[in-house]
Every structure is written in structure tokens, then in C-alpha cells.
Amino acid sequence: KSPVFGPQEVSSVEGNSVSIKCYYPPTSVNRHTRKYWCRKGASGRCITLVSSEGYVSSNYAGRANLTNFPENGTFVVNIAQLSRDDSGHYKCGLGINSRGLSFDVSLEVSQGPELPNGTEVYTVDVGRTVTIKCPFKTENAPKTKALYKKIGQTSVLVIDSRNYVNPNYKDRIRLRIPGTGQLIFTVVIDRLRLSDHGLYLCQAGDGSNRDEKNADLQVLEPEPELVYEDLRGSVTFHCALGLEVANVAKFLCRVNSRETCDVVINTLGKRDSAFEGRILLNPQDKDGSFSVVITGLRKEDEGRYLCGAHSDGQLQEGWPIQAWQLFVNEESTIPRSPTVVKGVAGGSVAVLCPYNPKESQSLKYWCLWEGAQNGRCPLLVESQGLVQEQYEGRLSLLQEPGNGTFTVILNQLTTQDAGFYWCLTNGDTRWRTTVEIKIIEGEPNLKVPGNVTAVLGETLNIPCHFPCKFSSYEKYWCKWSNTGCQTLPSQDEGPSEAFVNCDENSRLVSLTLNPVTRADEGWYWCGVKQGHFYGETAAVYVAVEEKKVAGSRYVSPAKADAAPDEKVLDSGVREIENKAIQDPRLFAEEKVVADTGDQAGGSRASVDSSSSEEQGGSSK
């Protein structure tokens, strides 16, 4: 007995479609071997019509496909525009037609139900609205109008002009009789159910003079749109369900193995924990359409997704739905980058963000995912240099290392910085990625003064102590502005006493400002890097005051003050929305930090070698 299983008999009518699902044991060999659908000829040979390797016979061109679902151990053959000629004996199978594992399927395509003459056919998707038009003659204008459903040989009253409504259609049907002169009445059925499918009869009047019109209503399930996305990438489901449900709760759900649909996210605040940090439901437009973005795609995200509308925020019969079949390509063009980056309180992280290397000129963005309600992602920084106010002095987006990767550095970390962040551009939306920042126990590796007050016109020397493990790294100082961090000359001053457990390789690198000017006020970063890969950073704020005492100042960690208070954000934040693909601005207006001035002047010195730290502190 073959372990392949499927429908032994399939019957349909001309013009219809069939979807034949064949099941196989999902062993490693079976999952990857060729799948086929062939037709058995008189000679006993089975001629391939469609296969998983992309072959489609001329007879099936444009109307058939075969899709393998290796995780489920199934493949599906879809055949559209059936004709009587398609009737016959077929096999669905694995391997080679003549000696592989297979299952016999008989397909019978008939002419279809004989419809009475003059029958109007209405083809509508489930959950949508149909308007059935029913003409009548003048003499029947004052008489009763009705719609019946034909079930076998009987006719069941659905609605009439005497206010009768069949309980199966309660609250979703209405009969409209126009003003004088218009010889047509209409029946509108909302939220169509699959059970509404069938033959209907409009009737006006009674007896031999009555007017009758037949209507064949075909209620269809939506065909899933096939969506192929890369592992680690992003997918956007655009859901347009129509104005009728514009004010009804929306949802996205995923069909499970029992063929029920588990809510992934809805507008009532429900969200599947498997999508934490990597999903957004974008607010709907006036027409009721909305979209759901999922980033950081995993293989297990594959499957059938439905979006819909219902007051309960979940799938219910008779409400409009849209369907997708998501495939996640494991041979991804999106490079691996850490999904979790760890940093210590007071320390820093450097996050590597991938982007499509063909779009090097695209604007780069970094936003903070917020889970409240439908999820949102307020923009924190962008490559044009705009930084949200409360991140002033501690956040920077760098174009390096380039060629498909940019870097985001966040320092002065606190436990409040833990969370999910998204890397994105105004270009290819499929390259959106998610990274989680975790704050762990530990001490920052770089030590700088907390707060420095410099005297106008004098010399300021700011030390940055680094441990021996960074001895081979390039050290740098830079002056932060909302357009980046401009590198400054610094002085490697030899051994440091800040790391008592370290040998003579523990050093300090100093920044000297000579003479101090008003323009020198602002944030300075000390950091380490290796080539274009950034490691840890430490930030210090320099305040400039009028000269009180002559002489130069050398600031050591012992004299450091607390960091200055952060500014409070009082403006609206910009967030990801549907326009992300086309609109380089991406998000709604917000207040922007003023540029903190020109780079500092002063003495210049050479810089040491270079580096990037492991995942505690950088994304290398």
C-alpha cells in the first residue's frame, strides 16, 4: 500500500476550480523529492501535467500549479477553468511517475447544474454583499414582492415586502422597493455565508400573472495569495475588506493544524506572544483597509493567514476575509545579524542593521517597538540626523560599515532601554529587521568622567580608561551632534590605574581641548572599534563656564559629577505606517533636537588601533 493519500474521487463543474491536496509521510527524503500530478493514458503511462520542479504542461499553462508544503507533508494541485476534457484518471505522487509513491485520483467534470433560462449569476466572496435585481411589470407594482431560495424541489421564503425575514438571514438582508416608475426591486444580502450559495427566485405578484426571475448565487472562499519572503526579513499583509466593515474590529489570524484560526493580532489589543516585538497593525484608512507588518521572519511563521473583520476580533462565518499563504525562504538574501544584543547599565550597545545593498542611498531609520494596543514604532534616529529629544547625546546612526549594513550606537544604557528595536529604510520594506536589547548585570568597560565643566579659554583634558582586552582596538573620541559623531584627535597616554586587575596594557586615551571655546559645549563619546565595526562607547557631557581661576584643568573620574538631566520629550512621535514604502519621511511630525554646534577646536594627537566588542556591547 502506498503511504501517499488524497481524495479518491473529485467532482466539479465546468468553469470551476479544484484544489487537490495529497498527503505524504514528511520524512527528510519525501519532503525534498519531486512532487507531480500526472494523467493516466490508455497505454498505462502517466503523463506529467505539473510538477514541483516548475514544469507545467501546455494543456495546464496559466491555469494550474503545484505547491509543496514540506512541514505538513502535503502538496496541493490547483486546477482552474475546468472543462469536460479534464475528466479522467490521475495520480499525485512523489519521485518518478512510473515507480514512485503515488495515489490514484479520479476527476469528473460535469456540465454543471441546469439553470433555468434567463438566470442571472452572481459570484461574490464570502462575507461580502450582493444585490439581487428583480424586475417586474407595472400590474405587479402594488403586489407582494418576495425572494425564495430553491432547495431541491421546494422553495423556501427568504424575505418579502410584508416584513417577513427568514431567521437564517436575520439582520443581514433587506428588500428595497423603489419609487413609482421604476419597475425593479432589489434584495441586498450582507455578510454572505457559504451556506447562502444556491439558486434564488425573485417573485412579484401571484397567480399566472406573477413576475419571476432566477438568480444563481455563488459564494466563494477567497483564494489565498501566495507570498514568498526571506528568512529574517519582513512581510506586509495589506487587508482591504470594504467600507461595510470600516468600523468593525479587525484581525489577522493564522490557520492551525486543526484548521481553526488563531489570532495573531487584532484591534482589540490581542497579540500572539510568538510575535512579540516584531509585529505592528497599522491604523486603518478611512476605507477600513489596514496592514500588518511582521519582521524577523522565522521558518515557523510559514502558513495560511487570514485577515478579517468581526466585533469579536476573530474569525466568524459570514464576515469578509482575505487570505495569504506565506512561504519563508531559508536561502535568504538577508544576512544573519544578532536578534539579541546585551549591554550593561551605564554601558553601550552597537547594533548592526542590514539593508538591501542595492539601496545604499536609502534613508536609514531605527525605531522602538511599543506593544500597547496594535503596536507602534516611534522613530528614534534616522540617517539624516534627526534624533528624538530624550536620546540626545546617547544615540547615533552611522552609515558604516556600509555595503548592506549600518550601525546604531546607544549608550548611557538604563534598564528602560531594554526592549525591541526595528532597523528599517525608506527602500525595500522586506529588509526590516528586529533586534532585542537586554540589560544584563555588569560594569561598563570604558570609564569616563560623568560630567565635566570646562573653563572658557583654558585647556581641558578628558580621560577615557579602557581595559587591556581593548589594547589592539582603535580608540577614538568624537563630538556628538544630531547628525552623527565627528571624530576628534585624541592622545593615547599609556597605562591606566582604573583597572586594577589588568596589566600594563590597560590604558587611557585622552581628549584635549585647547583652548576651550563656547562651541565645545556638548556631548563627547569615547569609543573603540575595529575597522568599520564599532564596539563600546562611553559618553561625557562638557559644560563651558566663564573663567574664574587661571590655569588648565585635568579631569579624572574621581572628580566626575553626575550626568546632566535628560530633556523630556513633549512632542508627538513619528511611527511606521503603510506609507513606509514610498514615503521617505515615513512618520508624522515631531520636534527635532537642534544641532549642538561645530566640532571642537584644540590640540590634535594621533589615535591608537581599533575594534568591536562581542555581543555584550556590540553586534559583531
Epitope: 493519500f5 451556506s195 444556491g198 455563488q218 490557520v255 493544524s257 484548521e259 495560511r304
Partner: nanobody, 129 residues
Framework: QVQLVESGGGLVQAGGSLRLSCAAS????????MGWFRQAPGKEREFVAA??????????YYADSVKGRFTISRENAKNTVSLQMNSLKPEDTAVYYC????????????????????WGQGTLVTVSS
């Protein structure tokens, strides 16, 4: 709520025929799946046959042990599914259960009991040798 009521069971001689019917009440099944399972004394419940439909398209599935002998069919107007059993064998003796599901999405493997939402009480078929 959907109720499923089986009928047509009884005692029959080997080689004989029986026709089981399953009537679904409480909800229109214009699209979905209905199936037959059976449980012989001391054995686990097993798949016999199933029928899935949507609009004018129907899919019929059979267990290898009944292929060519049993035929499943559906009468839309009466909301019933029948199982015509020919060439009955003593090993067909079992309680036969009707099962049904209605879903907006295509079903999974029809042989799986978890695929069905509603079950009947069962009807006994005894085939004597």
C-alpha cells in the same frame, strides 16, 4: 449547535449491503466536511470515508480497507451524508460514527479525528459470517 444523528445500522450477512445515513441538524452545511469512522470491539476508532465540498466541487476519501466496496455521498437538500456499504465482511463489524466540521478554510488530513468538530452517537453494524 449541530446535532448529528446516524441511522441504518443493523445485522447483515457477509457479502450483504447496508446504507448508513447521517443527518445534520441545527446548521446548514453548504461547505465543509463530513466523515465516517468506526470502532470495533477492543480496537481504536479508525477512519472509513469522508466527503468535503464547497459549492459545486466535491472530494471523496476512502480508507484502503473499504476502497471499491463503500461509497460516500451527500444529499445537499436534506443536509445528509450516506455511506453505502457493499460486499460487507465480518471485519467490518463495528460501531460507525458520523463526524462533521464546517470551516472557512480548507481542511487538513480528513483521516484525523481532530479535524472534526461534531460527532454522532454511533450506530452498530454487525456482519455475521
Amino acid at each position: 449547535q449541530v446535532q448529528l444523528v446516524e441511522s441504518g445500522g443493523g445485522l447483515v450477512q457477509a457479502g450483504g449491503s447496508l446504507r448508513l445515513s447521517c443527518a445534520a441538524s441545527g446548521r446548514a452545511f453548504s461547505s465543509g466536511r463530513m466523515g465516517w469512522f468506526r470502532q470495533a470491539p477492543g480496537k481504536e476508532r479508525e477512519f472509513v470515508a469522508a466527503i468535503s465540498w464547497s459549492g459545486h466541487t466535491t472530494y471523496k476519501y476512502y480508507a484502503d480497507s473499504v476502497k471499491g466496496r463503500f461509497t460516500i455521498s451527500r444529499e445537499n437538500a436534506k443536509n445528509t451524508v450516506s455511506l453505502q456499504m457493499n460486499s460487507l465482511k465480518p471485519e467490518d463489524t463495528a460501531v460507525y460514527y458520523c463526524a462533521a466540521r464546517q470551516s472557512l478554510v480548507a481542511g487538513g488530513d480528513p483521516r484525523g479525528q481532530s479535524e472534526y468538530d461534531y460527532w454522532g452517537q454511533g450506530t452498530l453494524v454487525t456482519v455475521s459470517s
